[in-house]
């Protein structure tokens, strides 16, 4: 039975040209995390393998950085980065847990940062 839950940064906003950290946390399970995939709509942004480390998609190499932890840092944000992001935790023996984050990239310099995992 899958008992775990994923806590995420939820709905967040950031300024165009800035950076943001996407963060998820899996709790309430003793399952072993084997890999975490970060996806944006139909694109795979990055993979963090528990044994092997990080690989960033070749199409996002310039704008995505691994970490902190199992999180992902998006840089040089554009309004086209607005949308849903998913952290997909592959675990053993539980299976797959998915967390959702909605990012809004604002033109204005008054983007609000409300989530506790976010860059201040």
């Amino acid at each position: 039975m899958m008992t775990g839950t994923i806590e995420t940064t939820g709905n967040i906003s950031a300024e165009k040209g800035g950076s943001i950290i996407l963060q998820c946390h899996l709790s309430s399970t003793t399952a072993q995390v084997t890999q975490v995939n970060w996806e944006q709509q139909d694109q795979l942004l990055a993979i963090c393998n528990a044994d092997l480390g990080w690989h960033i998609s070749p199409s996002f190499k310039d704008r995505v950085a691994p970490g902190p932890g199992l999180g992902l840092t998006l840089q040089s944000l554009t309004v086209n980065d607005t949308g849903e992001y998913f952290c997909i935790y592959h675990t053993y023996p539980d299976g797959t847990y998915t967390g959702r984050i909605f990012l809004e990239v604002l033109e204005s310099s008054v983007a609000e940062h409300g989530a506790r995992f976010q860059i201040p």
Epitope: D42, Q43, L44, N49, H55
Partner: antibody
Framework: EVQLVESGGGLVQPGGSLRLSCAAS????????MYWVRQAPGKGLEWVAS????????YYPDTLKGRFTISRDNAKNSLYLQMNSLRAEDTAVYYC????????????WGQGTTVTVSS | DIQMTQSPSSLSASVGDRVTITCKAS??????VAWYQQKPGKAPKLLIY???ARHTGVPSRFSGSGSGTDFTFTISSLQPEDIATYYC?????????FGQGTKLEIK
């Protein structure tokens, strides 16, 4: 069992067009990035195109941009490569391949379909 | 573009021999390197990904190592069925690029 079966190859004249297809089975097609890779006779492997899971983004080497178009139909479990303005140097075996779920790497390949561009 | 320079281009070895192929990237590709085996008239098969991880079902005599720009592929004890051409590939950056291949023959 993962299966990828290419079709649509053949003999075409320079300047002509051809559409290759790849029928996928044995896995949830819509969950995977897909690729086309080609191999000219007696030569090495050359990446041709990539497409994301839903088909929203496509990638090509600069040398092929504008002439080749990768697409997919997830309802039909099919991948396509539209090739226009074909040249003699496009003569090759064309393979479709699936991206691994563990990494950005091609883990399963079809048997290939042969394209010959000649007058 | 990242060039993958593979060496040697061909080699002849005896059954039971340890065989080593090297691949040098023209710039840092971290560990985003795969190795494929291609037998005549057949499609390539993935052997190694993430520079050193064996793909499902690949025998333990095949191994890979390296990071950055220098990578090595090893067959610890050559078997007759290993006769093939082997390719390295980097997938760190677009365009994805392959080495020119190493044709392995039995002495």
């Amino acid at each position: 069992e993962v299966q990828l079966v290419e079709s649509g190859g053949g003999l075409v004249q320079p300047g002509g067009s051809l559409r290759l297809s790849c029928a996928a089975s044995g896995f949830t097609f819509s969950d995977y990035y897909m690729y086309w890779v080609r191999q000219a006779p007696g030569k090495g492997l050359e990446w041709v195109a990539s497409i994301t899971k839903g088909g929203g983004s496509t990638y090509y080497p600069d040398t092929l941009k504008g002439r080749f178009t990768i697409s997919r139909d997830n309802a039909k479990n099919s991948l396509y490569l539209q090739m226009n303005s074909l040249r003699a140097e496009d003569t090759a075996v064309y393979y479709c391949a699936r991206q691994s779920s563990y990494d950005f790497v091609m883990d399963y390949w079809g048997q290939g379909t042969t394209v010959t561009v000649s007058s | 573009d990242i060039q993958m320079t593979q060496s040697p281009s061909s080699l002849s070895a005896s059954v039971g021999d340890r065989v080593t192929i090297t691949c040098k990237a023209s710039q840092d590709v971290d560990t985003a390197v795969a190795w494929y085996q291609q037998k005549p008239g057949k499609a390539p098969k993935l052997l190694i990904y993430w520079a050193s991880a064996r793909h499902t079902g690949v025998p333990s005599r095949f191994s890979g190592s390296g990071s950055g720009t220098d990578f090595t592929f090893t067959i610890s004890s050559l078997q007759p069925e290993d006769i093939a051409t082997y390719y390295c590939q980097q997938y760190s950056n677009y365009p994805l690029t392959f080495g020119q291949g190493t044709k392995l023959e039995i002495k």
